[in-house]
Amino acid sequence: KESCDVQLYIKRQSEHSILAGDPFELECPVKYCANRPHVTWCKLNGTTCVKLEDRQTSWKEEKNISFFILHFEPVLPNDNGSYRCSANFQSNLIESHSTTLYVTDVKSASERPSKDEMASRPWLLYR
């Protein structure tokens, strides 16, 4: 029979290549039986995972699975890194595998503002 433990369906060593400036939704697929567990996202910093308290998250419910979504609106260059979701269930902590975001900064050297543009828009220097 199907297990009634909470299960988090993030693949081990999974990766996403995304562009800075675009919106992106990072999904944590969650399977549970009765009560939906409390789920959080954290970002790995070395061996510790720093909880993302102030980020926009939401739930998407489907028939056999639910998704706890971390929203990036938009993706920033420093969103690069590894993320993990965790579920609290009957005083057990269940951790997913980590998933890595590789952020490409579209403001590559060839697309940087010209000197003329910088002169007329000096705030670009401080973005």
């Epitope: 299960q7 988090l8 693949k11 081990r12 999974s14 990766e15 996403h16 290549s17 595998h97 980590s98």
Partner: antibody, heavy 119, light 112 residues
Framework: EVQLQQSGAELVNPGASVKLSCTTS????????IHWVKQRPEQGLEWIGR????????KYDPKFQGKATITADTSSSTAYLQLSSLTSEDTAVYYC????????????WGQGTLVTVSA | DVVMTQAPLTLSVTIGQPASISCKSS???????????LNWLLQRPGQSPKRLIY???KLDSGVPDRFTGSGSGTDFTLKISRVEAEDLGVYYC?????????FGGGTKLEIK
């Protein structure tokens, strides 16, 4: 019933390309990683790379980078291995393998495809 | 790359006797999630490989319990408590902790 059905044997000319297929059934291909493995005659196994059909992300052994291209089509539950600029060194049996990505719960192998590079 | 070294190269065993295969990795296979991603495969003559053991010691469904996997870090062992005729073939260890994933050179089990 779980199956990984690989395409038939190929005899190809040096310098040509070939595209092998691996059609999966009995599980959701998006829940797995698809690996491709090379086995030269009477030799051991060499890992070529793996594809995540859920998002297309692919990792290669650097020695196969530029030689191999791994893709997957989730609508047909089929994975592909394309080999380019073929030489006699590429004569081998190529296996696809599907490993569950979350909890390692299964690891299935196809029957293999023999590629012979010869003029 | 992680080098996987298997020993012995060939193993001749009498039916009903035990067998043991060693696999050593050039670096630890302990992943940051606390698990060790070491598989054992059997390739019977003329067939494709088949996974026997994953995560060092977990048996695949349908694999007889005469097979046991053990070890940690860089040292791993596959044991067969009583060899049967269907066990002949080449055994490979395979690590999928570090990219690129790598196989051992194989150990051929022959029946005496």
């Amino acid at each position: 019933e779980v199956q990984l059905q690989q395409s038939g044997a190929e005899l190809v000319n040096p310098g040509a390309s070939v595209k092998l297929s691996c059609t999966t059934s009995g599980f959701n291909i998006k829940d797995t990683y698809i690996h491709w493995v090379k086995q030269r005659p009477e030799q051991g196994l060499e890992w070529i790379g793996r594809n995540d059909p859920a998002n297309g992300n692919t990792k290669y052994d650097p020695k196969f980078q530029g030689k191999a291209t791994i893709t997957a089509d989730t609508s047909s539950s089929t994975a592909y291995l394309q080999l380019s600029s073929l030489t006699s060194e590429d004569t081998a049996v190529y296996y696809c393998a599907s490993y569950e990505g979350y909890y390692e719960r299964f690891g299935y192998w196809g029957q293999g495809t023999l590629v012979t590079v010869s003029a | 790359d992680v080098v996987m070294t298997q020993a012995p190269l060939t193993l001749s065993v009498t039916i009903g006797q035990p067998a043991s295969i060693s696999c050593k990795s050039s670096q630890s296979l302990l992943d940051r999630d606390g698990k060790t991603y070491l598989n054992w495969l059997l390739q019977r003559p003329g067939q494709s490989p088949k996974r026997l053991i994953y995560l060092v010691s977990k048996l695949d469904s349908g694999v007889p319990d005469r097979f046991t996997g053990s070890g940690s870090g860089t040292d791993f062992t596959l044991k067969i408590s009583r060899v049967e005729a269907e066990d002949l073939g080449v055994y490979y260890c395979w690590q999928d902790t570090h990219f690129p994933y790598t196989f051992g050179g194989g150990t051929k089990l022959e029946i005496k």
